[in-house]
């Protein structure tokens, strides 16, 4: 018996179609995914094959306009509208708190909604009592087939769940269900997950029972010969892990933001064994033409985004100071604004220890692309935002060896002076450089803001010591040079939509006045 | 609206079997369980077994195997179950109900048939 | 099998009372517990699933709770109607398997 597992994860409110890099599509020939050119590939291979489930691993919610103004809203509609067959909850579906989770998509999805390892509890319980699963059997063709769910126990860290979800082991949580699962006599068991690509494969090795693991998270890109894009695979699609009792268990992930649908196919014998798989990722190019019917939705439902981003946020008292002349060279309020809305935008009090759980940031200078002038009645809406932010990323956040900081600040002024944008604006740290010494031994004074302390003061920076960090996913990445975060972050997890977070910052202040109040310094 | 609709009141004797229909109707018959459980006179409820019209699977209490059969016949959203080798104490009213495949709780029951075993 | 163990067995109580059914499993159900009530000559009505989710149109005065293998039925304010027998059931393990039944009477 062949099911086709069709996939999708860390969507990120790319309901329209992009360019390449995932940001704003410019040039509509050559712009990639959206939902609208994602049905017409389902649909077309629900008419050619026989049993098919699509599925969604998790974090529609954040990263675009449209989740800013729809709130969860769109993903359910479009969601449903494309039939989805299960999703899984990922950290981002918390963002909006448990509320924001619950009224605009749990309410209103017509598709199963998926997680073993959340367990309500309190008040919240019988609020929430049946909106999501720990799993779901499908009815495909003459057989079920089993779809048991999962999403990051840091899920506390990353977003905003509130204190009555407690998130569980993901292993410890997942094997009773499978086995429940397994009474039922359901013997095709895919768990549908949003813990990233490691715990993906932890497991297949780990849960018996489990036959496919279909995950997301880490936005891991697999694929089985020459890619069909930029992304470089971490590995063959499906990644085949051997499980303790000996089995073969395919894990599949499809990269990011609608750019691809996962394409695998798995083959049973008659006793629910895989016994064979093979697929790839399904590049969704302007070759696949966009379902008009669905464009046309997605259409109707733009016009409210186009009003949204002319309307004021908040106000400003002050020029906010996003000009290269400054970001590039010194601290520049903009700077310290944005970090600020980093730090405000993570606030997660988790443990009475630790007033909070990261109080750093860093920004590189040369993704702060335009000022914006108090004189226009200080007003700041997303269109003035969008112009200090353009590139549609995310501020993540990420754990790092005080060393790694240490080469990252010697890095930020290795060639001082030439405009260029690795120029580190900060927050929750104090700098000081000496441009007399030479590159790579410029930083005599790096201090940082304490977490563990009822009163936050600036200590000096210990080299041995981990470090959680808010930063854009340019620098995780190992953007404007970075390489060493990259090579040495010991743990990333992706963040809200930038904008989205300063909008969110601004909104709530309503009205700001950053100053440059000596973070940056040069002896 | 959902509604289970089961055949009337059998009196067979000890060795007989007996036959008793399910005709679902107000749902997709396919895509739920049919479960059937009995109450003997002044007892409690024993569940006897499951089938999932979708497939024809089906899931039996130990204690019955052999002796119950279910089958379903989906032109009609029929669902039957046969119960063979009476004895006094198979005496009982037995009950349809539907259940979802995943979660056997049971959300809609049939009115109830009356089976007396009698020599 | 899963052994589900209900008390008391029978209660007497007056209109207005507040009434507490108990139910322990033999193991732990993860959960998988539904309440039911049954009137004289009729089929079993579902209350609650999942130990607290109420069906639609049952009254809110009927509330589950509990984990691992102790759950509880509570009536806050009994009302006439709601004389009957009540029986749990668990759902995690087959055979699925109620509990022995409570018989509530008017006092």
């Known amino acids: 018996w062949e099911l086709t597992i069709l996939h999708t994860n860390d969507v990120h409110s790319r309901l329209e179609q992009t360019s390449e890099d995932s940001s704003k599509c410019v040039n509509a020939s050559r712009c990639m995914g959206g939902v609208a050119r994602l049905f017409t590939k389902v649909q077309q291979i629900r008419r050619a094959e026989p049993n098919v489930l699509l599925l969604d691993a998790g974090d529609q919610y954040q990263g675009t306009i449209w989740f800013t103004v729809y709130k969860g809203a769109e993903v359910a509609h479009f969601m449903n509208a494309l039939r989805y067959d299960a999703m899984a909850l990922g950290n981002h579906e918390f963002d909006n708190g448990v509320e924001g989770l619950i009224e605009p998509l749990l309410k209103e999805a017509k598709f199963p909604i998926l997680s073993a390892n959340i367990k309500a509890k309190g008040p919240l319980a019988s609020q929430i009592s049946g909106l999501y699963l720990p799993y779901k059997v499908l009815p495909v063709g003459d057989e079920v087939v089993g779809i048991v769910g999962y999403t990051s126990k840091e899920t506390p860290f990353l977003s905003n769940p509130g204190t009555n979800l407690v998130f569980e082991d993901e292993i410890t949580a997942l094997q009773p269900e499978v086995d429940k699962l397994k009474t039922l006599n359901v013997n095709k068991i895919i768990a549908l997950g949003h813990s990233g690509f490691e715990m993906d494969k932890l497991i297949a090795q780990k849960v018996r029972g489990v036959d496919v693991v279909v995950g997301g998270h880490s936005n891991t890109f697999l694929y089985t010969g020459n890619p069909p894009s930029k992304e470089v695979p971490a590995g063959k699609y499906p990644f085949i892990v051997t499980s303790d009792d000996g089995r073969k268990v395919p894990v599949v992930q499809a990269y990011a933001f609608g750019k691809y649908l996962g394409y695998l196919k798995i083959e049973f014998d008659e006793r629910g064994n895989v016994i064979s798989s093979h697929g790839n990722p399904i590049l969704l190019n302007s070759s696949i033409p966009e379902d008009p019917s669905i464009k046309a939705d997605i259409n109707k439902w733009r016009i409210k985004l186009d009003n949204y981003s002319t309307q004021e946020l908040g106000k400003t008292i002050v020029y906010l100071d996003g000009s290269s002349q400054s970001c590039r060279f010194r601290e520049c309020n903009m700077g310290n604004l944005i970090c600020d809305a980093m730090i405000n935008n993570n606030l997660r009090h988790t443990d009475e220890m630790f007033w909070n759980h990261v109080s750093m940031c860093i920004l590189n200078g040369g993704g702060i692309r335009s000022p914006i002038d108090e004189r226009n009645n200080g007003t700041i809406t997303w269109e003035n935002l969008a112009a200090v932010l353009p590139f549609g990323g995310t501020f993540d956040l990420v754990q790092l060896k005080g060393s790694t900081l240490k080469k990252a600040f010697e890095h930020s002024v290795h060639r001082y002076g030439q405009s260029t944008g690795e120029f580190l604006q900060v927050g929750g740290i104090h700098v000081v450089y000496d441009l007399s010494r030479k590159p790579g031994d410029r930083v005599v004074k790096l201090d940082v803001l304490c977490t563990k302390c009822r009163v936050p003061s600036y200590d000096p920076l210990k080299m041995d010591e981990v470090y959680k960090v808010i930063l854009p996913n340019f620098l995780a990445n190992g953007g404007d040079g970075f390489q060493m975060i990259k090579d040495e972050l010991l743990r990333h997890d992706s963040g809200d939509q930038d904008i989205n977070v300063v909008s969110t910052y601004i909104s709530k202040m309503k009205v700001i006045y950053p100053a440059v109040e000596g973070r940056i310094k040069f002896s | 609206q959902v509604q289970l609709v089961q055949s009337g009141a059998e009196v067979k004797k000890p060795g007989a079997s007996v036959k008793v229909s399910c005709k679902a109707s107000?749902?997709?018959?396919?895509?739920?369980?049919i479960h059937w459980v009995r109450q003997a006179p002044g007892q409690g409820l024993e569940w006897m077994g499951a089938?999932?019209?979708?497939?024809?699977?089906?899931s039996y209490n130990q204690k019955f195997k052999g002796r119950v059969t279910m089958t379903v016949d989906t032109s009609t959203s029929t669902v039957y179950m046969e119960l063979s080798s009476l004895r006094s104490e198979d005496t009982a009213v037995y009950y349809c109900a539907r259940g979802d495949y995943d979660e056997s709780y049971f959300d809609y029951w049939g009115q109830g048939t009356l089976v007396t075993v009698s020599s | 099998d899963i052994q589900m163990t209900q008390s008391p067995s029978s209660l007497s109580a007056s209109v207005g009372d507040r009434v507490t059914i108990t139910c322990k499993a033999s193991?732990?159900?993860?959960?998988?517990l539904a309440w039911y009530q049954q009137k004289p000559g009729k089929a079993p009505k579902l209350l609650l699933s999942?130990?607290?989710s109420l069906e639609t149109g049952v009254p809110s005065r009927f509330s589950g709770s509990g984990s691992g293998t102790d759950y509880t039925l509570t009536i806050s304010s009994l009302q006439p109607e709601d004389f009957a027998t009540y029986y749990c059931q668990q759902y995690w393990s087959i055979p699925w398997t109620f509990g022995g039944g409570t018989k509530v009477e008017i006092k």
């Open positions: 999942g130990v607290i």
């Open positions: 193991e732990g159900i993860y959960n998988r």
């Open positions: 107000g749902y997709t018959f396919t895509t739920y369980n």
């Open positions: 089938i999932f019209p979708g497939n024809g699977h089906i």
